[in-house]
């Protein structure tokens, strides 16, 4: 049966928590990704940014989960207007920022 949106979001949050807590070496070898605007369309924007990181097993599950939230197909090299222009940050910081934002959405009851 389909997973309720609240459960799906909670599972994504749990995965991001696990990534941040289990991080020993620099996440994804310190790869840089585009920073995104967290105010709207966060799932697709996050996926568009993270999909450009390849060969990083630590975030593969996150990429799959974000894909489940994003209603359209996302491929590498694709960028929407939600990207913060010319600002790149490390994947580890991107994950932390995304986690804070998603936890707030969950607490507010915004599951979709």
């Amino acid at each position: 049966s389909p997973v309720p949106p609240s459960t799906a979001l909670k599972e994504l949050i749990e995965e991001l928590v696990n990534i941040t807590q289990n991080q020993k070496a620099p996440l994804c070898n310190g790869s840089m990704v585009w920073s995104i605007n967290l105010t709207a369309g966060v799932y697709c924007a996050a996926l568009e940014s993270l999909i450009n990181v390849s060969g990083c097993s630590a975030i593969e599950k996150t990429q799959r989960m974000l894909n489940g939230f994003c209603p359209h197909k996302v491929s590498a090299g694709q960028f929407s207007s939600l990207r913060v222009r010319d600002t790149k940050i490390e994947v580890a910081q991107f994950v932390k920022d995304l986690l804070v934002h998603l936890k707030k959405l969950f607490r507010e009851g915004q599951f979709n």
């Epitope: 459960t7 909670k10 749990e14 928590v17 807590q21 936890k103 707030k104 607490r107 507010e108």
Partner: antibody, heavy 123, light 107 residues
Framework: EVTLRESGPGLVKPTQTLTLTCTLY??????????VDWIRQPPGKGLEWLAH???????RYNPALKSRLTISKDTSKNQVVLKLTSVDPVDTATYYC???????????????WGQGTLVTVSS | DIQMTQSPSSLSASVGDRVTISCRAS??????LNWYQQKPGKAPKLLIF???MKPRGVPSRFSGSGSGTDYTLTISSLQPEDIATYYC?????????FGGGTKVEIK
Amino acid sequence: EVTLRESGPGLVKPTQTLTLTCTLYGFSLSTSDMGVDWIRQPPGKGLEWLAHIWWDDVKRYNPALKSRLTISKDTSKNQVVLKLTSVDPVDTATYYCARTVSSGYIYYAMDYWGQGTLVTVSS
Amino acid sequence: DIQMTQSPSSLSASVGDRVTISCRASQDIRNYLNWYQQKPGKAPKLLIFYTSMKPRGVPSRFSGSGSGTDYTLTISSLQPEDIATYYCQQGNTLPLTFGGGTKVEIK
């Protein structure tokens, strides 16, 4: 030491508004990941969750009572206030406030409780 | 809302007995299950959170287990000070909901 202390009127008449205050000691509701819940327990009965407020002012209510409840915080006084409108004798209960901490995963577990304040609704 | 059903509603056991209390959720709560102990005339006290985690100061005789919809609180060796009502609570989905309670008495 973390403690919470509820205060209330003790006796309220039907149709009136009940105002309860929870004063927090040993922690601050301005600290990230802190939350405060209100729970009530009618005499001889079980526990019912009423409302929750997070450090960043995100508020959630029990849908069964949402239209009658308002939760707010005063960070400067380190207090959380709960208002319940249009009270009825069935609202007679001991009202507890409790602390929730959500570090990492978001789970709601109330790790410290106040001693409770008994509120009787009667004319 | 998620319904929480506790069993038994009351039990009587001897000092030193192993006691188990069950809690069933109406849907999967993914281990977000807490247990509270409430002694007569007192506020509830957190005993177990996230199915099996214990706050500091909780005696080792208390343990929690379970997954999905079914959870258990175990007191490995009942002590006189354990006379109380025990409540389960799901912390997965709002509104938060509690079981009806299990009253534990000494024979």
